[in-house]
Interface confidence: medium
């Protein structure tokens, strides 16, 4: 006869490890007992459990409540045991010694490997600003045994670089994602994907990109100069820009204070019924934490086209 076992048994941390030991013999052979031991280089061979055909399972005090027989149905030639709730300290060599009748004793050794799944963490890089060169967007670190795989899943164009180091019984892997920040990346997801033999499925951590920028400012409302005439109501100038963080707006008049009645409401400058006093250079100021921009326009309020006298005056004045 011979023992059927496995050179290497792999179990995930916290799960039950089945240590296999099956005697394959002639039909008339019997297994009297199976002795299990931990082969510890420090302390020699330490008994784990004794599986007796007549008296059942006896577990040594050090492993009480941790060693069981596999659930039924059980084959009388099967000396396998379950080691409950495997921890990293269980990693090492185990030995089963099978006493048979009439063939005698057989023994086999196996190595238990405990997989330690990673707990990944994602760390965003420094604040991203449009205009920067290649910049760290985020780094993702995962430590486990064996080494986890760390990659990135994103539509954003960038470069990945990994570094890893072995540490005692585990390995740590850090992957960095670098990019050249642009406003189109704002709100885009950057996902760290961690794979490991101890995980049923990949672990994913998503970071939403925020790129600080401030667009050039421009002013809308003067497209048709002929609309800017004395008496017109509801005239407005709107400052156009966009940014991240969202910008704040302010209006000033270059050649003095804003005329009375002119109201600032966010990005919009609202005028009362127009008079020639409203003519002037208006400046829109846009700013956020990153930068500030300005755009200026010249408003020229025309005399009322229905008043020919004023029209003549306007022409002669010019």
């Amino acid at each position: 006869g011979e023992l059927e076992t496995s050179d290497l048994v792999t179990v995930v941390l916290g799960q039950d490890a089945k240590l296999p030991c099956f005697y394959r013999g002639d039909p008339d052979e019997q297994v009297g007992q199976v002795a299990w031991a931990r082969v510890d280089p420090n302390e020699g061979t330490r008994e784990l459990a004794l599986l007796h055909s007549k008296y059942g399972l006896h577990v040594s005090p050090a492993y009480e409540d941790r060693v069981e027989q596999p659930p039924p149905p059980r084959d009388p030639l099967d000396g396998s045991i379950l080691l409950r709730n495997a921890v990293q300290a269980d990693e090492g060599e185990y030995e089963c010694r099978v006493s048979t009748f009439p063939a005698g004793s057989f023994q086999a050794r196996m190595r238990l490997r405990v997989l330690v799944p990673p707990l990944p963490s994602l760390n965003p890089g420094p604040p991203l600003e449009e205009g920067q060169g290649l910049t760290l967007a985020a780094s993702c670190t995962a430590e486990g045994s064996p080494a986890p795989s760390v990659t990135w899943d994103t539509e954003v164009k960038g470069t990945q670089s990994s570094r890893s180091f072995k540490h005692s019984r585990s390995a740590a892997v850090t992957s960095e994602f670098h990019l050249v920040p642009s406003r189109s990346m704002n709100g885009q997801p950057l996902t760290c994907v961690v794979s490991h033999p101890g995980l049923l499925q990949d672990q994913r951590i998503t970071h939403t990109l925020q790129v600080a920028f401030l667009a050039e400012a421009s002013v809308r409302g003067l497209e048709d100069q002929n609309l800017w005439h004395v008496g017109r109501e509801g005239a407005t100038l709107k400052c156009l820009s966009e940014g991240q963080p969202p910008p704040k707006y302010n209006w000033t008049r270059l050649d003095g204070p804003l005329p009375s009645g002119v109201r600032v409401k966010g990005d919009t400058l609202g005028f009362p019924p127009l008079t020639t006093e409203h003519s002037g250079v208006y400046v829109c100021h846009v700013s956020n934490e990153l930068s500030s921009r300005a755009s200026q326009v010249t408003v020229e309020v025309l005399a009322d086209p229905e008043d020919p006298g004023k029209q003549v005056d306007l022409v002669s004045a010019s």
Epitope: D7, P146, H167, A171
Partner: antibody
Framework: EVQLVESGGGLVQPGGSLRLSCAAS????????MHWVRQATGKGLEWVSA???????YYPGSVKGRFTISRENAKNSLYLQMNSLRAGDTAVYYC?????????WGQGTTVTVSS | DIVMTQSPDSLAVSLGERATINCKSS????????????LAWYQQKPGQPPKLLIY???TRESGVPDRFSGSGSGTDFTLTISSLQAEDVAVYYC?????????FGQGTKVEIK
């Protein structure tokens, strides 16, 4: 019998390349982390690279970017691709198995970098 | 990176006498999770590859004579040959396998006085 046998060493000019191989037998190769360690004549041991059971790789700064370690579990083989070789890379290169230290070593293969 | 420093560089001891080699690491190699020191000792004879003597700072590799013993924890370690034999003439190296890049000490040459 547990055994590691290196091959592929030889004389190469500075800037050249060489690929070392290590054939493993007598144990479940795929279950062990593997290493390359070198030793210049009359000098001490220097760790060169390691590869884990899932193909994770590790290098010291002195060879990073020039050397690449790899493994082929189906062939029980370990490799070291060495590019941009320098005179300072001249040494005996050993492959070694890791299990609580480097418990199994090959006999080594000699690499000489010289013009 | 962890730097390993051995002392002395060479050592001459009479047959049957005790030989002691020290090894210091620039940072601790004690892994708190399992309370093990990730330090190994190797013996290398001329023309041969290194041979693992001790791992986890104090555990003898199988087949290694019990006159070899290791001790220490954290950053300071010692290899002791209790009664030097002629076949123990060799260079001895300590190595940390706590974290990459793995590093060896510079070696200690043991000779017979």
């Amino acid at each position: 019998e547990v055994q590691l046998v290196e091959s592929g060493g030889g004389l190469v000019q500075p800037g050249g390349s060489l690929r070392l191989s290590c054939a493993a037998s007598g144990f479940t190769f795929s279950s062990y982390d593997m290493h390359w360690v070198r030793q210049a004549t009359g000098k001490g041991l220097e760790w060169v690279s390691a590869i884990g059971t899932v193909g994770d790789t590790y290098y010291p700064g002195s060879v990073k970017g020039r050397f690449t370690i790899s493994r082929e579990n189906a062939k029980n083989s370990l490799y070291l691709q060495m590019n941009s070789l320098r005179a300072g890379d001249t040494a005996v290169y050993y492959c070694a198995r890791e299990w609580n230290g480097m418990d199994v070593w090959g006999q080594g293969t000699t690499v000489t970098v010289s013009s | 990176d962890i730097v390993m420093t051995q002392s002395p560089d060479s050592l001459a001891v009479s047959l049957g006498e005790r030989a002691t080699i020290n090894c210091k690491s620039s940072q601790s190699v004690l892994y708190n999770s399992n309370n093990k020191n990730y330090l190994a000792w190797y013996q290398q004879k001329p023309g041969q590859p290194p041979k693992l003597l001790i791992y986890w700072a104090s555990t003898r590799e199988s087949g290694v004579p019990d006159r070899f013993s290791g001790s220490g924890s954290g950053t300071d370690f010692t290899l002791t040959i209790s009664s030097l034999q002629a076949e123990d003439v060799a260079v001895y190296y300590c190595q940390q396998f706590y974290t990459t890049p793995y590093s060896f000490g510079q070696g200690t040459k043991v000779e017979i006085k």
